[in-house]
């Protein structure tokens, strides 16, 4: 379960792949496309609020029915849409949604050597926001596989004008 | 109740080597990324290592690169930190730390060890 | 790699005073920064987390703030258990670095 209702930190950043393709969000036919692409020099980064939450894990050893926290995020590129999982589709998509957010918002965020992250959905552990033919996509990751495969590890590069949504 | 309770420490002469170990009870060991840090006497802390829950993944500081191993055993619930070519310099009290989240590393260092201490001298 | 500053080194102060500690890193490192204290022969304890949340069984009267660079730590009453020396800690990127440290001591 989510610890608080409210995000213990919130940031802006852009968000690139591994190999430094910027991740871009665009508006086309009122729904929001996700793209993985080159960015031309000039061309601004786009920006992401990421909110960070707590989630207890469920106990296996400790007696308080508790171990341990994860850290929890969700992306939001512009105000209102939030990325989602769509395990069915295997699918990152934008949705318009209303705060509680549901769990396929929500991403546990997991720090990788080299100060990359990758991101695992709540609602199917062990699957993960990879790169997928210059897209988004759903990767399902074996554990007992180094969870370090390039294409599920993305970089936040801060953008410090703080914390405001960006419309 | 987590508890962490490192070992190995002792004098050693420069150039020589020690293998410091941490024995995690109270929480499941396997699913933390775990830390060293160590402290020289009347000193401040300084990071020493990290190794990823798994084990696949290592990192080291500088000034102990090539020279220290961080290595752990998840069936025996220990961490180990092997020292190796030891100088004056490393002579400190090194403790072992469990990162506050399971995943991410963002949170700091919630649990630590008592520390052990290693004396590098002729 | 990131590094960290801390002042004062050492504050002298009084049961009751509110004492504040700043802490600066040389680039931006969002909220990911923790507190410590350490008294002499102990492990450090974890106080603050994610720049301003307080560790479980804290005292309320320890508190954190700032984002980017710049962070302080207030404690807003000081207890005789409080003298000790305080850390900060960048957790935001490898290799993690801690500040120098500030000393509280007895006025």
């Known amino acids: 379960s989510i610890t608080g209702i409210s995000p213990i930190t919130e940031s802006l950043a852009s968000l690139s792949t591994y190999n430094d393709q910027s991740i871009t969000f665009a508006l086309e036919d009122e729904s929001y496309e996700i793209y993985v692409e080159d960015l031309k020099k000039d061309k601004k980064k786009d920006k992401v609020l990421l909110s960070y939450y707590e989630s207890q894990h469920p106990s296996s050893e400790s007696g308080d029915g508790v171990d341990g926290k994860m850290l929890m995020v969700t992306l939001s590129p512009t105000k209102d849409f939030w990325l989602q999982a769509n395990n069915k589709e295997h699918s990152v998509e934008l949705h318009k949604c209303e705060k509680p957010l549901p769990d396929q918002a929500f991403f546990v965020l997991h720090n990788r050597s080299f100060n990359c992250v990758s991101f695992e959905c709540k609602t199917d552990p062990g699957v993960f926001i990879g790169v997928k033919d210059n897209h988004l996509a759903l990767i399902k990751v074996d554990y007992s596989e180094n969870l370090g495969s390039e294409n599920i590890l993305f970089k936040l590069s801060e953008i410090l004008e703080h914390h405001h949504h960006h419309h | 109740e987590v508890q962490l309770v490192e070992s190995g420490g002792g004098l050693v002469q420069p150039g020589g080597s020690l293998r410091l170990s941490c024995a995690a009870s109270g929480f499941t060991f396997s699913t933390y990324s775990m830390h060293w840090v160590r402290q020289a006497p009347g000193k401040g802390l300084e990071y020493v290592s990290t190794?990823?829950?798994?084990?696949?993944?290592?990192y080291y500081a500088d000034s102990v690169k090539g020279r220290f191993t961080i290595s752990r055993d998840n069936s025996k619930n220990t961490l180990y930190l092997q020292l190796g070519s030891l100088r004056p310099e490393d002579m400190a009290v090194y403790y072992c730390?469990?990162?506050?989240?399971?995943?991410?590393?963002?949170?700091?260092?919630?649990?630590w060890g008592q520390g052990t201490l290693v004396t590098v001298s002729s | 790699d990131i590094q960290m500053t801390q002042s004062p080194s050492s504050v002298s102060a009084s049961v009751g005073d509110r004492v504040t500690i700043t802490c600066r890193a040389s680039q931006g490192i969002t909220s990911w920064l923790a507190w410590y204290q350490q008294k002499p022969g102990k492990a450090p304890k974890l106080l603050i987390y994610a720049a301003s949340n307080l560790q479980s069984g804290v005292p309320s009267r320890f508190s954190g703030s700032g984002s980017g660079t710049d962070f302080t730590l207030t404690i807003t009453s000081l207890q005789p258990e409080d003298f000790a020396t305080y850390y900060c800690?960048?957790?935001?990127?490898?290799?993690?670095?801690f500040g120098p440290g500030t000393k509280v001591d007895i006025k």
């Open positions: 800690q960048q957790a935001n990127s490898l290799p993690f670095t």
């Open positions: 190794i990823n829950n798994n084990g696949d993944t290592t």
């Open positions: 730390a469990r990162q506050t989240y399971t995943s991410s590393w963002y949170g700091g260092f919630d649990s």
